[in-house]
Interface confidence: low
């Protein structure tokens, strides 16, 4: 099928970064300024992404690809291909809609987005808090008294971070 | 589509007011937050201000507060920045820029004017 369609329509022939211009007996007429064609065979070239205001430039549009962009410093990408810029928070922070707010007591944030997310209940695992949490950080839990006889080891490490939004369970 | 178009920007004195405005189109402009940021030359883009859909929650960079107030009028569809007390620091490009409604503190790539640009200088 591929070779028929091939033979029928000289459209199938023209490469990415050119398009089938109909206007010239549908001669592989290269793609215009600001524009691509990323795969072959194309009637029309795509317009180019434009980076402006908080997004900026990661990569150059080129007849073939279309121009990737990131965010400003102070922002992180959300969505696909970067599609929204987020304001960054500082660590002990979350977003809100009237700008970045301390996180409450008894919940933590260790990163300049997502959510404050509540401390560890280490009394649910049967330990003790060994270190306070803060803002910033979560508690680490220690032994239990009861745990603490000569031999037993002195410190669990800290559960693996949770990501983003996550409570714990 | 989301069309956004700044005006009122142009060369005034230190100590001097300038009144921004930003007409919205292609969008139901009461439903979103809304927010002003400006770009100084050589540097980067800095947060200016935010008002809430309804103008009742509004927020400000340290750097401008008790200097700039921002407004709406969602019946003209229209975003407002009233500059005083301008200092040269305050030279920039000054965007308007719709916040996603779902993410707060969120600008969506469509979501941007071209721009306008403040001189002041004696």
């Known amino acids: 099928f591929e070779r028929t369609r091939s033979l029928q329509d000289p459209c199938s022939n023209c490469p990415a970064g050119t398009f089938c211009d109909n206007n010239r007996n549908q001669i592989c007429s290269p793609c215009p300024p600001n524009s691509f064609s990323s795969a072959g065979g194309q009637r029309t070239c795509d317009i180019c992404r434009q980076c402006k205001g908080v997004f900026r430039t990661r990569k150059e549009c080129s007849s073939t690809s279309n121009a990737e962009c990131d965010c400003t410093p102070g922002f992180h990408c959300l969505g696909a291909g970067c599609s929204m810029c987020e304001q960054d928070c500082k660590q002990g922070q979350e977003l809100t809609k009237k700008g970045c707010k301390d996180c409450c007591f008894g919940t933590f944030n260790d990163q300049k987005r997502g959510i404050c997310r509540p401390w560890t209940n280490c009394s649910l695992d049967g330990k003790s808090v060994l270190v306070n949490g803060t803002k910033e950080r979560d508690v680490v839990c220690g032994p239990s008294p009861a745990d603490l006889s000569p031999g037993a080891s002195s410190v669990t490490p800290p559960a693996p971070a949770r990501e983003p939004g996550h409570s714990p369970q | 589509q989301v069309q956004l178009v700044e005006s009122g920007g142009g060369l005034v004195k230190p100590g001097g007011s300038l009144r921004l405005s930003c007409a919205a189109s292609g969008f139901i402009f009461s439903d979103y937050y809304m927010s002003w940021f400006r770009q100084a030359p050589g540097k980067g883009l800095e947060w200016v201000s935010h008002?809430?859909?309804?103008?009742?929650?509004?927020d400000y960079a340290d750097s401008v507060k008790g200097r700039f107030t921002i407004s709406r009028d969602n019946a003209k569809n229209s975003l407002y920045l009233q500059m005083n007390s301008l200092r040269a620091e305050d030279t920039a490009v000054y965007y308007c820029a719709r916040e996603d409604p779902r993410l707060s503190g969120t600008i969506d790539f469509d979501s941007w004017g071209q721009g306008t640009l403040v001189t002041v200088s004696s």
């Open positions: 008002i809430s859909s309804s103008g009742s929650s509004i």
